[in-house]
Interface confidence: low
């Protein structure tokens, strides 16, 4: 891979756990300046595979609140507004990074954790297994 | 909010930037032990709003590789396999946490960053503005 020269202004790395333990600045930098919330905020209701959002809260995690999508139907909404069970509503899942307080209840010590969240739902053609 | 008693085994927090700067252990704990990747890996192809996945790589970010979804069509795939432009394929977006090396090129110093990623696509009924 590419070797990037180390910045001489880097913090000291004498910690015996280095490089497993790193310093992280929690002042979040938000790169999402050009997003337009109006365009996407109601997709959960307008989708042919609509979903509800459920609040998952854990004070030992950062961020402490995560919203989880749950598909409303097994099937998908057809042009008449009815549920068509020849199609399936399925959750789109994504692995995300969160910080877990470790040791527990510590305000300034965390461990990276990877969790799977359902972000929304999509309508798919089902896989049909034909039995001979 | 709930006040949780502080663990006496917490690391020292004398850092002048505390609590903005915290220690993070990069040994990732993966909570997704029961997930079956095969179950959702082909949704991008089977969806009525199919998408392609594009690799976004940045060595100054952790994780350095992020996959971005791009909807294949403006419309959605109908029962005949054709694109129906009376419906819209739209990206489902999510804000995620990443770590950005700061100062640049430092192996052990990061800043939390929030970025918006497209995880997949869903099919929605368009908003039609009727002009009087």
């Amino acid at each position: 891979g590419i070797t990037i020269p180390r910045n001489p202004g880097c913090p000291n790395s004498e910690d015996k756990n280095f490089p497993r333990t790193v310093m992280v600045n929690l002042n979040i930098h938000n790169r999402n300046t050009n997003t337009n919330p109006k365009r996407s905020s109601d997709y959960y209701n307008r989708s042919t595979s609509p979903w509800n959002l459920h609040r998952n809260e854990d004070p030992e995690r950062y961020p402490s609140v995560i919203w989880e999508a749950k598909c409303r139907h097994l099937g998908c909404i057809n042009a008449d507004g009815n549920v068509d069970y020849h199609m399936n509503s399925v959750p789109i899942q994504q692995e995300i990074l969160v910080l877990r307080r470790e040791p527990p209840h510590c305000p300034n010590s965390f461990r990276l954790e990877k969790i799977l969240v359902s972000v929304g739902c999509t309508c798919v053609t089902p896989i049909v297994h034909h039995v001979a | 909010g709930i006040t949780i008693p502080r663990n006496p085994g917490c690391p020292n927090s004398e850092d002048k930037n505390f609590p903005r700067t915290v220690m993070v252990n990069l040994n990732i704990h993966n909570r997704n032990t029961n997930t079956n990747p095969k179950r959702s890996s082909d949704y991008y192809n089977r969806s009525t709003s199919p998408w392609n996945l594009h690799r976004n790589e940045d060595p100054e970010r952790y994780p350095s590789v992020i996959w971005e979804a791009k909807c294949r069509h403006l419309g959605c795939i109908n029962a005949d396999g054709n694109v129906d432009y009376h419906m819209n394929s739209v990206p489902i977006q999510q804000e995620i946490l990443v770590l950005r090396r700061e100062p640049p090129h430092c192996p052990n110093s990061f800043r939390l960053e929030k970025i918006l990623v497209s995880v997949g696509c869903t099919c929605v009924t368009p908003i039609v503005h009727h002009v009087a």
């Epitope: 959960y44 609140v65 919203w67 972000v119 | 999510q94 804000e95």
Partner: nanobody, 119 residues
């Protein structure tokens, strides 16, 4: 640190009114669209109303149109929801939220205020 603190909830009879308030801090309030969202017992999240940064545009879910009014006071960094002609189905925890209401996982939500509509 972003903080959103809701107040004004309570028990009210059908047909009654309530005014919810949300006090914001830790961010430039006037730069963001703001939402009221609600979660009824055992149900998913439902967005109720949205107001643009400058208050120029408002959006409502169909079930509250004509009954609820969203407003804001940027000088006071406050968001409001005037709820009239309340119905039993409006019973929920009401949250004010900053920005987008996709399934984000940032805690830019208050702890909520409970509205109970019952005779």
């Amino acid at each position: 640190e972003v903080q959103l603190v809701e107040s004004g909830g309570g028990l009210v009879r059908p047909g009654g009114s309530l005014r919810l308030s949300c006090a914001a801090s830790g961010f430039t309030f006037s730069s963001y669209g703001m939402y009221w969202v609600r979660q009824a017992p055992g149900k998913g999240l439902e967005w109720v109303a949205k107001i643009e940064q400058d208050g120029s545009e408002e959006y409502y879910v169909d079930s509250v149109k004509g009954r609820f009014t969203i407003s804001r006071d940027n000088a006071k960094k406050s968001l409001y929801l005037q709820m009239n002609s309340l119905r039993a189905e409006d019973t929920a925890v009401y949250y004010c939220a900053k920005g987008e209401i996709l399934p984000l996982y940032f805690d830019y939500w208050g702890q909520g205020t409970l509205v109970t509509v019952s005779s």
